[in-house]
């Protein structure tokens, strides 16, 4: 039961995380730009990975996409790539994990296959979460190092006027959404990997040796019972008619230690 719960919870947490990564990638509020002493009028700027927006004090809002690729910083392109890779891996992970869920029966899929799929999806979620966290962190670092506080001194020729304008860049809501979503996806992935260990089959069959007596004896193998709940196909004592001591290696199946679930 614990395995199913861990797997299910991991799936849900990852699902929420990936939804958050998608939301963060699409959001416009990755950074905001404020002028400390704006000499013109109250205008608020905020930027995302794909477009820049302006909101006026009147409530008017307008967004404009970054139509050029060449003029964009390499760091921004890297952040875009990381977020997209995170989304793609997460989406594939979700698809794989749906089929891996223990509570869903698909044909005669064995536990070993489900365990492998759970591990695969778990690793995908972990990488997806790391991509999102890395992308958001790279963007945050870019803001701090390159843009955080840019000061411009304005000189005019005739009047001899000097004005200093400071542009302050602050972290937008999308950064926090991205960090939290990446963390959730990562946690969900770890939970899936933990669940995988519980799903993995273990060899619990005991090798039995049969001895033949004189004549046309029939050797019973008391050790030939499968160490399981009795739901397997090899639950009866098998008779060996050909004589000679041998081990029972025929018709082996690999039951899960969690067949009780």
């Amino acid at each position: 039961m614990a395995v199913t719960a861990c797997q299910g919870l991991g799936f849900v947490v990852s699902l929420i995380g990936i939804a958050g990564i998608i939301a963060a990638t699409c959001m416009d509020q990755w950074s905001t730009q404020d002028l400390y002493n704006n000499p013109v009028t109250a205008v608020f700027n905020y930027q995302g990975l794909w477009r820049s927006c302006v909101r006026e004090s009147s409530g008017f809002t307008e967004c404009r996409g970054y139509f050029t690729l060449l003029g964009l910083p390499a760091m921004l392109q890297a952040v875009r790539a990381l977020m997209i890779v995170g989304i793609v891996l997460g989406a594939i992970g979700l698809l794989v994990s749906i089929f891996a869920l223990k509570c869903i029966r698909i044909g005669s899929m064995e536990d070993s296959a489900k365990a492998n799929m759970t591990l695969t999806s778990g690793i995908m979620f972990i990488v997806s979460g790391l991509c999102a966290i890395a992308g958001v962190s790279v963007f945050a670092n870019m803001l701090v190092t390159n843009f955080w506080m840019s000061t411009a001194n304005m000189y005019t020729g005739m009047g001899g006027m000097v004005q200093t304008v400071q542009t302050r860049y602050t972290f937008g809501a999308a950064l926090f959404v991205g960090w939290v979503a990446g963390g959730l996806t990562l946690i969900g992935g770890v939970m899936m990997c933990i669940a995988c260990r519980g799903l993995a089959p273990e060899e619990t069959n005991y090798k039995a040796v049969s001895y033949h007596a004189s004549g046309h004896s029939v050797a019973y193998k008391p050790g030939g019972f499968k160490a399981s709940t009795g739901f397997g196909s090899n639950t009866k004592n098998k008779k060996i008619y050909d004589g000679g001591a041998r081990t029972e290696d025929e018709v082996q199946s690999y039951p899960s230690k969690h067949d009780y679930v």
């Epitope: 730009q33 006026e56 304008v165």
Partner: nanobody, 122 residues
């Protein structure tokens, strides 16, 4: 590099009219707002009028309300100031000011023109 080029200044009689223009050029991503400031001889800088480029919200100094009209042409990145009923106290150097987003991944900054002289005298 961004440039603001003003034009339209000159000598005019009291009660007359002038139209100032300010053209913004360079690697402009978008214009937040633009405005006109003036500096009379021996005085400080004062805001004359300002306009946001998106919504077109305007702001005027009390001394010019009803006489001056600010407007913009978004397609040309140009700012205008129509000055009517000019007075002697309007004599000053008029500076164009622009709050711009510049570059591919735009950075916000404020730019100033070199100024154009308006003299109101009989």
């Amino acid at each position: 590099q961004v440039q603001l080029v003003e034009s339209g200044g000159g000598l005019v009689q009291p009660g007359g009219s002038l139209r100032l223009s300010c053209a913004a050029s360079g690697s402009i991503f978008s214009i937040n707002a633009m405005g006109w400031y003036r500096q009379a001889p021996g005085k400080g800088l004062e805001l004359v009028a300002a306009i946001t480029f998106g919504g077109g919200s305007t702001n005027y100094a009390d001394s010019v309300k009803g006489r001056f009209t600010i407007s913009r042409d978004n397609s040309k990145n140009t700012l205008y100031l129509q000055m009517n009923s000019l007075r002697a106290e309007d004599t000053a150097v008029y500076y164009c000011n622009a709050d711009l987003l510049v570059g591919g991944f735009p950075r916000r900054n404020v730019y100033w023109g070199q100024g154009t002289l308006v003299t109101v005298s009989s």
